[in-house]
């Protein structure tokens, strides 16, 4: 807390400008009007305030807006955002994607902080769902964002948003998350032709059921081993040797190198030896 002291004569701030960097903390508290600060927040980022001075400015805004800052102020917080706690942010009502982008820009290059996580949570809850534009924005700043959501949270992602997802956005997703995302992707890409469809759906296939894998095996897709290794074990087990051969195409030879790894080892174990022998790879069931 900064003590309440009278502003020295002639020091009352008429605007937010660089002269304020020479003010001591108590002078900032006494001489800067909170309402003036709120209307000229966009200027704060251009001025090299110290962390201690930023603490004073935050304190003034907190006093002016005890119920939470209005979006007009939030949008221009800039580096002052780094001073906010998750508790502060929970009081906000952020509805503009531009505001979200402005604040994410401040944290760019760093891992997702608790403040950013809270901000995103408030924003998405305010919108009611994770729409395409929001997802575009969030994955641009945090490629792993999608995989940080619980399966329950992912269920609110509309299929139309799936178009914004890039393969690298799914790198850290676990099987339960892909179980939720795959049906949405299937719906989103349903009108694409065979080869284009496979390119789009490929990174979601860790959530695909057996029947969809069987259908893909009839389409000459030539799935690579890296994708095959990410398939659900229970979805792979019922596939016949012929179906796996069709699914992988020329990549089927890669099964030999993966024979000790899941899901290949589980699948091999469940095949008849004479069927495995037709592959000519020396796989032993």
């Amino acid at each position: 807390e900064v003590e309440k002291t009278a502003c020295p004569s002639g020091k009352k701030a008429r605007e937010i400008d660089e002269s304020l960097i020479f003010y001591k903390k108590w002078e900032l508290e006494a001489c800067v009007d909170a309402a003036l600060l709120a209307t000229q927040m966009d200027r704060v980022n251009a001025i090299p305030f110290t962390y201690e001075q930023l603490d004073v400015l935050k304190h003034k805004l907190d006093e002016l807006y005890p119920q939470g800052y209005p979006e007009s102020v939030i949008q221009h917080l800039g580096y002052l955002f780094l001073k906010m706690s998750p508790e502060d942010i929970r009081k906000w009502n952020v509805t503009s994607l531009e505001t979200l982008k402005a604040l994410l820009e401040v944290n760019k290059g760093h891992e997702m902080s608790p403040q950013v996580a809270t901000l995103i949570d408030r924003f998405v809850k305010g919108r009611g769902q994770l729409d395409k534009d929001t997802l575009d924005t969030l994955t641009a700043f945090y490629p792993g964002y999608l995989c940080s959501l619980s399966p329950e949270e992912l269920s609110s992602v509309p299929p139309s948003s799936i178009w914004a997802v890039r393969p690298q956005d799914l790198d850290t997703c676990d099987p339960r998350q892909l179980d939720v995302l795959y049906p949405k992707a299937r719906l989103a890409f349903q009108n694409m032709n065979g080869s284009e469809y496979f390119v789009k759906i490929q990174s979601f296939l860790g959530g695909a059921p057996t029947e969809d894998l069987k259908a893909l095996s009839q389409q000459n897709v030539s799935m690579d081993l890296a994708t095959f290794m990410k398939l659900r074990t229970d979805a792979v087990l019922p596939l016949t040797v012929a179906e796996v051969q069709k699914l992988l195409g020329p990549h089927v030879e890669g099964l030999k190198a993966e024979e000790r790894h899941r899901p290949v080892r589980d699948w091999i174990l469940r095949q008849r030896q004479d069927d495995l022998d037709t592959l000519g790879l020396g796989l032993q069931g």
Epitope: M229, K230, T233, L237, R260, R262, D266, R270
Partner: antibody, heavy 119, light 107 residues
């Protein structure tokens, strides 16, 4: 509710063959989704996987024990068995049978049987 | 073979504490990581499978996270019955291997 029960001698002489049987009740050893493993734990030490079998008779053994291990299955008796040859004192352990279910984990275990190798 | 390294090997904690145990695989194992609890004289009991899925009947204070090579088991609020040894296990590649165990003792 699937249950597993190990049985076999608690004392085996060095250089002889350790033989244990695991009886499956409340379920079938012929399940499509499950494999059946043997795991052991020397006194005061950690867990070591010995190998597993599928109802078809297909097996997979730990390379460190492969030359001495045989796991077999008898679907008519709903049992699977372990044979470990040429035992030494280092094979003294609690031996567990376990089911590796469709979730890829050992979700059901027997209570374990202590086998001591001593003359 | 894939080596599983658990840390710490032992820890002392009090009832109500938040406890975190880590497990590292010597190569990527995707999400094929399971956690078990073992009490003296008893068989291990499955707690978490596929890195983060809670086994049926296991209290929700247990949770798992991670993928690739680094995994964590968390007990959000330690209860008297949770004092035991915990093992991680990879099911990605044979031979199936376990971590060395973490003994959770009463402080």
């Amino acid at each position: 509710q699937v249950q597993l029960q190990e049985s076999g001698p608690g004392l085996v002489k060095p250089s002889e063959t350790l033989s244990l049987t695991c009886t499956v009740s409340g379920g079938s050893v012929s399940s499509f989704t499950d494999t059946w493993s043997w795991i052991r734990q020397p006194p005061g030490k950690g867990l070591e996987w010995i190998g597993y079998i599928y109802y078809s008779g297909s097996t997979n053994y730990n390379p460190s024990l492969k030359s001495r291990v045989t796991i077999s299955v008898d679907t008519s008796k709903n049992q699977f068995s372990l044979k470990l040859s040429s035992v030494t004192a280092a094979d003294t352990a609690v031996y567990y049978c376990a089911r590796e279910g469709k979730n890829g984990a050992f979700d059901i275990w027997g209570q374990g049987t202590m086998v001591t190798v001593s003359s | 073979d894939i080596q599983m390294t658990q840390s710490p090997s032992s820890l002392s904690a009090s009832v109500g504490d938040r406890v975190t145990i880590t497990c590292r695989a010597s190569q990527s194992i995707s999400s094929y990581l399971n956690w078990y609890q073992q009490k003296p004289g008893k068989a291990p009991k499955l707690l978490i499978y596929a890195a983060s899925s809670l086994q049926s009947g296991v209290p929700s204070r247990f949770s798992g996270s991670g993928s690739g090579t680094d995994f964590t088991l968390t007990i959000s609020s330690l209860q008297p019955e949770d004092f035991a040894t915990y093992y991680c296990q990879q099911s990605y590649s044979t031979p199936l291997t376990f971590g060395g165990g973490t003994k959770v003792e009463i402080k």
